[in-house]
């Protein structure tokens, strides 16, 4: 049995330009201790979309549902979507360390942007 699952329930989300996109992610446990980060794309060129403790992400807001009992919610909302935001977004769990170590990624959610 897996000790930690990172779940991105939607494979794809389609949003009209100018609207907001909600990207859902839950983790089954806080253990191992460490942060959740959001990225667009994979590999060394991936773009950091949101980190709770570091950086400035003016268009990104955490929208977790803290009432969830059986898992932890790490969902985000990206406002004022433009075609440049299209891509696949990954919710990634890290194990705390120096530096933090990537542990497990969600399956990804593809964001497509429709014309207004």
């Amino acid at each position: 049995e897996e000790e930690l699952q990172v779940i991105q329930p939607e494979k794809s989300v389609s949003v009209a330009a100018g609207e907001s996109a909600t990207l859902n992610c839950t983790a089954t446990s806080l253990i191992p201790v460490g942060p959740i980060q959001w990225f667009r794309g994979v590999g060394p060129g991936r773009e950091l979309i949101y980190h709770q403790k570091e950086g400035h992400f003016p268009r990104v807001t955490p929208v977790s549902d803290p009432t969830k009992r059986n898992n932890m919610d790490f969902s985000i909302r990206i406002s004022n979507i433009t075609p440049a935001d299209a891509g696949t977004y990954y919710c990634v769990k890290f194990r705390k360390g120096s530096p933090d170590v990537e542990l497990k990624s969600g399956a990804g959610t593809e964001l497509s942007v429709r014309a207004k």
């Epitope: 049995e1 897996e2 000790e3 930690l4 089954t28 446990s29 806080l30 253990i31 191992p32 201790v33 460490g34 942060p35 959740i36 709770q52 403790k53 955490p62 929208v63 977790s64 803290p66 009992r69 059986n70 898992n71 932890m72 919610d73 790490f74 969902s75 985000i76 194990r95 705390k96």
Partner: antibody, heavy 118, light 112 residues
Framework: EVQLVESGGGLVKPGGSLRLSCAAS????????MSWVRQTPGKGLEWVAT????????YYPNSVKGRFTLSRDNAKNSLYLQMNSLRAEDTAVYYC???????????WGQGTTVTVSS | DIVITQSPASLAVSLGERATISCRAS??????????MHWYQQKPGQPPKLLIY???NLESGVPDRFSGSGSRTDFTLTINPLQAEDVATYYC??????????FGGGTKVEIK
């Protein structure tokens, strides 16, 4: 009904060792994060150790790190705390605690008393 | 370490009145909109019992006269109206990403 039953407490001399056990029933033990929390009249509640559901990850505060070792046997629904190099300040009631997400301490056993004294 | 200052240490409230307990963390215990502060009740001779998880969520089976509020560093447990069976010691506990996890010193609630 969730049940956590601790055993193994007792009187031990400073520098000695004890092994606490916790027998779990009434829930899917292998899916839960497990911890020990201790309570003393002077210091109140103090987190002692936590282990992930599969046993891969363990965490301790500095006060017990290197002296206490937490392990689990999911086949036996059991949790163990090996306590070495015991000190007078380790005297406390030790509670076995389960946690669904590793966030809050959801269910507590009745506790077992450890007394470290010469 | 995140230090939790819980106040008051003891509280005497009349039956049917409101009891309010506060916990202040030395730094934020929030992440992704979750506040990792929890509240427990302990009656004499018994282990602690979870009342409120993640600042404001009532644990199953806990009466709704108990409520929790707050975020970041400041949190409150409210019992309204206080009943005789609520006489106990109440503890807050933070389980943020920063170890070690810590508890408040406790608040003993009595009937005035």
């Amino acid at each position: 009904e969730v049940q956590l039953v601790e055993s193994g407490g007792g009187l031990v001399k400073p520098g000695g060792s004890l092994r606490l056990s916790c027998a779990a029933s009434g829930f899917t033990f292998s899916s839960y994060v497990m911890s020990w929390v201790r309570q003393t009249p002077g210091k109140g509640l103090e987190w002692v150790a936590t282990i992930s559901s599969g046993g891969t990850y363990t965490y301790y505060p500095n006060s017990v790190k290197g002296r206490f070792t937490l392990s689990r046997d999911n086949a036996k629904n059991s949790l163990y705390l090996q306590m070495n190099s015991l000190r007078a300040e380790d005297t406390a009631v030790y509670y076995c605690v389960s946690s669904m997400t590793g966030s809050s301490f959801d269910y507590w056993g009745q506790g077992t008393t450890v007394t470290v004294s010469s | 370490d995140i230090v939790i200052t819980q106040s008051p240490a003891s509280l005497a409230v009349s039956l049917g009145e409101r009891a309010t307990i506060s916990c202040r963390a030395s730094e934020s215990v929030d992440s992704y909109g979750n506040s990792f502060m929890h509240w427990y009740q302990q009656k004499p001779g018994q282990p602690p019992k979870l009342l409120i998880y993640r600042a404001s969520n009532l644990e199953s089976g806990v009466p709704d006269r108990f409520s929790g509020s707050g975020s970041r560093t400041d949190f409150t447990l409210t019992i309204n109206p206080l009943q005789a069976e609520d006489v106990a010691t109440y503890y807050c506990h933070q389980s943020s990403e920063q170890l070690p996890w810590t508890f408040g010193g406790g608040t003993k609630v009595e009937i005035k």
